[in-house]
């Protein structure tokens, strides 16, 4: 069992459409063929899973389970996009990376990306 460094940006501002993107980069100590990436949200003391994907190196990153996440992988970088965010989803989003295969298992947890989401102002009603 080994620890692994994971880097992610400290702060990201979601777009007016509720979309936030950030890069999660891990310092892979070995040649992993199977990688699992999980995005967790921490708000107050509650930790919840936002989305997760397991992928084979060199293959497309596929988020299952009706995910609000999409992503692509390139080497030791994972480009993550979270959609459908609202102001209430503002929080710390942690990137967790596990090198599942071959052994040894490695686990890395980023310090988190604070995603700020601002709900767009409704358009004022027109008089004509």
């Amino acid at each position: 069992c080994k620890a692994m460094h994971v880097a992610q940006p400290a702060v990201v501002l979601a777009s007016s459409r509720g979309i936030a993107s950030f890069v999660c980069e891990y310092a892979s100590p070995g040649k992993a063929t199977e990688v699992r990436v999980t995005v967790l949200r921490q708000a107050d003391s509650q930790v919840t899973e936002v989305c997760a994907a397991t992928y084979m190196m060199g293959n497309e990153l596929t988020f299952l389970d009706d995910s609000i996440c999409t992503g692509t992988s390139s080497g030791n970088q994972v480009n993550l996009t979270i959609q459908g965010l609202r102001a209430m989803d503002t929080g710390l989003y942690i990137c967790k990376v596990e090198l599942m295969y071959p052994p040894p298992y490695y686990l890395g947890i980023g310090n988190g990306t604070q995603i700020y989401v601002i709900d767009p102002e409704p358009c004022p009603d027109s008089d004509f």
Epitope: A3, R36, S45, V47, E49, A52, T54, L64, D66, I109
Partner: antibody
Framework: EVQLVESGGGLVQPGGSLRLSCAAS????????MSWVRQAPGKGLEWVAT????????SYPDSVKGRFTISRDNSKNTLYLQMNSLRAEDTAVYYC???????????????WGQGTLVTVS | DIQMTQSPSFLSASVGDRVTITCRAG??????LAWYQQKPGKAPKLLIY???TLAEGVPSRFSGSGSGTEFTLTISSLQPEDFATYYC?????????FGGGTKLEIK
């Protein structure tokens, strides 16, 4: 209140099959990773299978890989364990468990059902 | 697989005693360790996760410590309801293995 109720256990012959169910209530079932853990009579605990929130990811130890299949139906709030090619050493009480994340961002078996006994003989 | 070794396997103690159970991991698991309590005929109950964090509703007489490969569960003052079997389990990678258990009996 979180409630997990297992069913489907019983006596089965070696080589036979059995499907266990776990009915969940008191929480949003589709938001949680779920697992099965077993305990042979008078013995310790052994993790058997894990499934992600939507069922897209499953994991098993070598002892049951290829023989057991974990699945879930989120519309019915129910977890399943299909057990094929059963062996005498699979005799155990099977518990379903809800996994929660702790402050270390790793899952723990936070809530357990009362268990259902599977006897292979 | 990571081997988890608990000691002692059996422990006799009296109400009011302070008891300590040890769990050793076969390799470094950092703080990814949980403790469970199981009473006869009942399901296990989560006591501690992340080596030292008390689960919801668990009395403060229970405490956990350690990291790396050596961990301890301490009950500061045994109560009658604490006589049970205790298991440690690592949650670092897969498979997530349990210790063999420590049966705590009334002396």
């Amino acid at each position: 209140e979180v409630q997990l109720v297992e069913s489907g256990g019983g006596l089965v012959q070696p080589g036979g099959s059995l499907r266990l169910s776990c009915a969940a209530s008191g929480f949003t079932f589709s938001s949680y990773t779920m697992s099965w853990v077993r305990q042979a009579p008078g013995k310790g605990l052994e993790w058997v299978a894990t499934i992600s929130r939507g069922g897209g990811y499953t994991s098993y130890p070598d002892s049951v890989k290829g023989r057991f299949t974990i699945s879930r139906d989120n519309s019915k709030n129910t977890l399943y364990l299909q057990m094929n090619s059963l062996r005498a050493e699979d005799t155990a009480v099977y518990y379903c468990a809800r996994e929660d994340y702790g402050s270390s961002y790793v899952h723990w078996f936070a809530y357990w059902g009362q268990g259902t006994l599977v006897t292979v003989s | 697989d990571i081997q988890m070794t608990q000691s002692p396997s059996f422990l006799s103690a009296s109400v009011g005693d302070r008891v300590t159970i040890t769990c050793r991991a076969g390799e470094n698991i950092y703080s990814y360790l949980a403790w469970y309590q199981q009473k006869p005929g009942k399901a296990p109950k989560l006591l501690i996760y992340n080596a030292r964090t008390l689960a919801e509703g668990v009395p403060s007489r229970f405490s956990g410590s350690g990291s790396g490969t050596e961990f301890t569960l301490t009950i500061s003052s045994l109560q009658p309801e604490d006589f049970a079997t205790y298991y440690c389990q690592h949650h670092y990678g897969s498979p997530r293995t349990f210790g063999g258990g420590t049966k705590l009996e009334i002396k």
